[in-house]
């Protein structure tokens, strides 16, 4: 009997408001045994996969997606999904990334505190569950 997969969560480090040219890392979390984490942008047409999974806790795994130099075009909605054989999970909630021009003032913080989106009751499309990840994956430029 197939297990019910918990919805992933998504967060951003150092936060969700990022100065132009700074870096941001999206962190996706799911259960132990995840083979592939996918970070989706706005819709499923733009995404990035990783199989570089590590432990977040005894009961959770995580993957990180780093954008080295944030551009205005990186602003938008992001969410996570994962593949734990033999099926895909539901999507996480969306997390919105905002890109601001650096003010450079000594008193203005560069980012807002880290923000995350975990499971909620929002309905979610399960059609991913039929498909395994593409065997060749995707290059980073598909998303970044």
């Amino acid at each position: 009997q197939e297990e019910d997969l918990p919805r992933p969560s998504i967060s951003a480090e150092p936060g969700t408001v990022i100065p132009l040219g700074s870096h941001v890392t999206f962190v996706c979390r799911g259960p132990v045994g995840v083979q592939t984490f996918r970070l989706e942008r706005d819709s499923r047409s733009t995404y990035n996969d990783t199989e570089d999974v590590s432990q977040a806790s005894p009961s959770e795994s995580e993957a990180r997606f780093r954008i080295d130099s944030v551009r205005e075009g990186n602003a938008g909605l992001y969410r996570c999904i994962y593949y734990k054989p033999p099926k895909w999970s539901e999507q996480s909630d969306y997390l919105e990334l905002l890109v601001k021009e650096s003010s450079g003032g000594p008193d203005s913080p560069d980012t807002e505190p880290g923000s995350s989106a975990g499971p909620t009751q929002r309905p979610s499309d399960n059609s991913h569950n039929e498909h395994a990840p593409a065997s060749q994956g995707l290059k980073a430029e598909h998303l970044y």
């Epitope: 890392t25 132990v32 045994g33 083979q35 996969d49 990783t50 199989e51 570089d52 999974v53 590590s54 432990q55 806790s57 005894p58 009961s59 993957a63 990180r64 997606f65 780093r66 065997s135 060749q136 994956g137 290059k139 980073a140």
Partner: antibody, heavy 117, light 107 residues
Framework: EVQLVETGGGLVQPKGSLKLSCATS????????MNWVRQAPGKGLEWVAR??????????YYADSVKDRFTISRDDSQSMLYLQMNNLKTEDTAMYYC????????WGQGTTLTVSS | DIQMTQSPASQSASLGESVTITCLAS??????LAWYQQKPGKSPQLLIY???SLADGVPSRFSGSGSGTKFSFKISNLQAEDFVTYYC?????????FGGGTKLEIK
């Protein structure tokens, strides 16, 4: 078909150096962490080193027994994994395996290192 | 470092029987545990990951259980090709330590 092929093993004198290579194919190398594991003759398995992906700043980790002597590296453009081994000791004599992470699901056939005078 | 204590070091059994191998972690690792099979002169092969998940292509007579610090690995209906060596490994934190191995011998 996933393939990992290690090369570069051989006979080296103590305090010598050697570089092992692992050519990979059949999977997306640049999104996978990679490991080296070794097995001394007639002994059990010992994890040696791990390297993560660009998303994780190519972070590296080592067993205490090889720290400061071995260096793991990767070339994503060529789907290659390497292990530079310096100041070799007789106890480094082993079969060295290249292994895909994080679940160690694919292993190469291994390459043999013998450290002896 | 997390120590993995695997037992027994060797075990004799007959064809068709079941055997169970145990692995104890020196601290909690959740379900970050894998089991491998190694045939003489061959590379290890992943059988079980995440303590209970069967790797691709592995027969269902292999199974894993446990979480936290105590883990078990069971082979049901032993076949001739199963009489080889098995290892556990924790994947919770580096160094990713292995158990000492269990050699299955035919009775």
């Amino acid at each position: 078909e996933v393939q990992l092929v290690e090369t570069g093993g051989g006979l080296v004198q103590p305090k010598g150096s050697l570089k092992l290579s692992c050519a990979t194919s059949g999977f997306t190398f640049n999104i996978n962490a990679m490991n080296w594991v070794r097995q001394a003759p007639g002994k059990g398995l010992e994890w040696v080193a791990r390297i993560r992906t660009k998303n994780n700043n190519f972070a590296t980790y080592y067993a205490d027994s090889v720290k400061d002597r071995f260096t793991i590296s990767r070339d994503d453009s060529q789907s290659m994994l390497y292990l530079q081994m310096n100041n070799l000791k007789t106890e480094d004599t082993a079969m060295y395996y290249c292994v895909r992470g994080p679940y160690f699901d694919y292993w190469g056939q291994g390459t043999t290192l013998t450290v002896s005078s | 470092d997390i120590q993995m204590t695997q037992s027994p070091a060797s075990q004799s059994a007959s064809l068709g029987e079941s055997v169970t191998i145990t692995c104890l972690a020196s601290q909690t690792i959740g379900t970050w545990l894998a089991w491998y099979q190694q045939k003489p002169g061959k590379s290890p092969q992943l059988l079980i990951y995440a303590a209970t998940s069967l790797a691709d292509g592995v027969p269902s007579r292999f199974s894993g259980s446990g979480s936290g610090t105590k883990f078990s690995f069971k082979i049901s209906n032993l076949q001739a090709e199963d009489f080889v060596t098995y290892y556990c490994q924790q994947l919770y934190s580096t160094p990713y330590t292995f158990g000492g191995g269990t050699k299955l011998e035919i009775k």
